[in-house]
């Protein structure tokens, strides 16, 4: 299978988390516990 071509495991999981778990109907931006730039988005 094709694999990710990203530099870090954090980036891999960050992008996948946003892909699958961002709540498009919410103003939160993403699910609770998603870290962006070291800040946890609530």
């Amino acid at each position: 299978d094709a694999e990710f071509r990203h530099d870090s495991g954090y980036e891999v999981h960050h992008q996948k988390l946003v892909f699958f778990a961002e709540d498009v109907g919410s103003n939160k931006g993403a699910i609770i516990g998603l870290m962006v730039g070291g800040v946890v988005i609530a």
Partner: antibody, heavy 112, light 112 residues
């Protein structure tokens, strides 16, 4: 408001290439992954591939030799190219922003 | 590839009654980041699929709380506590833990 719209030919001849454009609005392609998914008539969903915010890609292993996904961030467009089409590539093709926002889909028939 | 097996294929339910759909995976969907990338979609007739639930059990905004998702590892369930007319369509599970991302075959919910 997030929107995605697929455009391209509705009919393609066997052995030819399919090119579909997904034009998006309401978000930046630099920040989000966009995926392509297809659905043959009366059947289920099949994931084709994804292009990430940084431009890297992942493809379905069964299609990796025929499939290419690219994008133009400045035009807010994502492109799918599928080569060597066969009749079983007949399907409605969807682009998605993540898993939560889907385009309306574009029906593509592969026929002589 | 990960195979997602949905049962039943068709579900005929009286309005107001409960419904349950199973999605079983050929391998564990627990990712190395500790999350389980299993989502549920509903495709109403003539429409694009719509995500209902992500990360096994989290409801999308606007999705009625009569829907619940549960499970872990290889066994997952979507339950509707009281079916309404707007719930008819085809339900799909979708895993994003392992490449290639794969879908279940779908469960058609019919209203009696």
């Amino acid at each position: 408001q997030v929107q995605l719209k697929e455009s391209g030919p509705g009919l393609v001849a066997p052995s030819q290439s399919l090119s579909i454009t997904c034009t998006v609005s309401g978000f930046s392609l630099t920040n989000y992954g966009v995926s392509w998914i297809r659905q043959p008539p009366g059947k289920g969903l099949e994931w084709l591939g994804v292009i990430w915010g940084d431009g890297s890609t992942n493809y379905h292993s069964a299609l990796i030799s025929r499939l290419s996904i690219s994008k133009d961030n400045s035009k807010s467009q994502v492109f799918l190219k599928l080569n060597s089409l066969q009749t079983d590539d007949t399907a409605t093709y969807y682009c998605t922003k993540g898993a939560g926002s889907w385009g309306q889909g574009i029906p593509v028939t592969v026929s002589a | 590839d990960v195979v997602l097996t949905q049962t039943p294929l068709t579900l005929s339910v009286t309005i107001g009654q409960p419904a349950s759909i199973s999605c079983k995976s050929s391998q564990s969907l627990l990712d190395s980041d500790g999350r389980t990338y299993l989502i549920w979609l509903l495709q109403r007739p003539g429409q694009s699929p719509k995500r209902l639930i992500y990360l096994v059990s989290t409801l999308d905004s606007g999705v009625p709380d009569r829907f619940t998702g549960s499970g872990s590892g290889t066994d997952f369930t979507l339950k509707i506590s009281r079916v309404e007319a707007e719930d008819l369509g085809v339900y799909y599970c979708w895993q994003g833990t392992h490449f290639p991302w794969t879908f279940g075959g779908g469960t058609k919910l019919e209203i009696k």
